[in-house]
Amino acid sequence: QPQGLSGMQGEPSLGDSSSGEDELGVDVLPSEEDAPEEADPPDGEDPPEVNSEDRMEESLGLEDLSTPEAPEHSQGSHGDEKGGGHSHWSYGGTLLWPQVSPACAGRFQSPVDIRLERTAFCRTLQPLELLGYELQPLPELSLSNNGHTVQLTLPPGLKMALGPGQEYRALQLHLHWGTSDHPGSEHTVNGHRFPAEIHVVHLSTAFSELHEALGRPGGLAVLAAFLQESPEENSAYEQLLSHLEEISEEGSKIEIPGLDVSALLPSDLSRYYRYEGSLTTPPCSQGVIWTVFNETVKLSAKQLHTLSVSLWGPRDSRLQLNFRATQPLNGRTIEASFPAAEDSSPEPVHVNSCFTAGD
């Protein structure tokens, strides 16, 4: 029986999982580089928004080493060659993102650190329902390197329900990763960063198109899963990873056979974390419903290596470490569809619970 994110002591270890996924736990203090910079103040407020990663970049001047693009302030002109708008952004200049889009300075941003002991068990969070995610090889799908990530554009017909009356359709999926020796997930769990993370972006069926939904509560929903190393190759991911060489250049786009998108996600869709946040790249629009699965997806070391070294970004630099630092919760509660807080300490003082109207 694989253990959950909430249940294990010590570093995450790999258990047997016939489905190709695993559940993890991270209860010990995370490694220093990923540890939260400071504990939350006594009144429960979150620490200041400047985080350890930005501090490290600024104080040590590591932007050029640790990002797929040199920071904007070293590029001469921050904006376009012709236009005065600040449209260029990079992972090396995240503190400048609010100049690209003011929403990036919002109070309810993503990603976040999921502190298990602070999650609220919410019995009303039901298993997710996915419909039409098992795509046939034809029609083919667009796979692109947009300079920030690898993106698979999804066709109409992939439907997902967060709950009764909360229906969405999938738009695209993309990945976030690190380097061969540095993890690159966007969300963290108790400060622990995973090797990589997949995001499947969905649009609420209440909106006919994306720009109506941006910034509206529940307008967009993202399903997120952590990718973790295991001895076995993941055949579903190989259908994506085998094409990365063909889109190694920034701006490349190819057509690949359709695949089973649900196979890229964990098999257990019932245990997850839920909170309201934002897009993790500009325009950083808020109101996004995040679902972060407890079960991880397992890829081989070779596959994770392929992901981290195959793509190139601007100025002939590798596309790596394409994750945003975790953002303060600012009073938000992360809900869990299972008692994660209960499992995370041997003798919980109390179990946070979720309250909905009418409870």
Partner: nanobody
Framework: EVQLLESGGGLVQPGGSRRLSCAAS???????????VAWYRQAPGKQRELVAV???????KYSDSVKGRFTISRDSSKNTVYLQMNSLRAEDTAVYYC????????WGQGTQVTVSS
């Protein structure tokens, strides 16, 4: 509703030049600031082919058939992307489409470019 509107097409002589424009309208967010924008073309009886792409970082990529002749650029303050086409050839005759790829695909209606003497 986001709309992409191409303009600048028409009849041009071989060896001549033309500049196509793609303007975005109807969106609350400047889509060209956050989307990779591409020009595609489709000649009669042929499949649509990717001509040029400009990413949000300003990176550009061109198909082999237009490399050195075409230049893609953007002016985010005007929410417009351009395709400067020089040394035009008869085989460049096609309908040219603008495509913005940010979370979902947006397409224009296309503009006809005919290269003929």
């Amino acid at each position: 509703e986001v709309q992409l509107l191409e303009s600048g097409g028409g009849l041009v002589q071989p060896g001549g030049s033309r500049r196509l424009s793609c303007a975005a309208s109807g969106n609350s967010v400047n889509i060209f600031s956050f989307a990779a924008v591409a020009w595609y073309r489709q000649a009669p009886g042929k499949q649509r082919e990717l001509v040029a792409v400009i990413t949000t970082t300003g990176g550009t990529k061109y198909s082999d058939s237009v490399k050195g002749r075409f230049t893609i650029s953007r002016d985010s303050s005007k929410n417009t992307v351009y395709l400067q086409m020089n040394s035009l050839r008869a085989e460049d005759t096609a309908v040219y489409y603008c495509n913005a790829d940010y979370l979902q695909d947006y397409w224009g209606q296309g503009t006809q470019v005919t290269v003929s003497s």
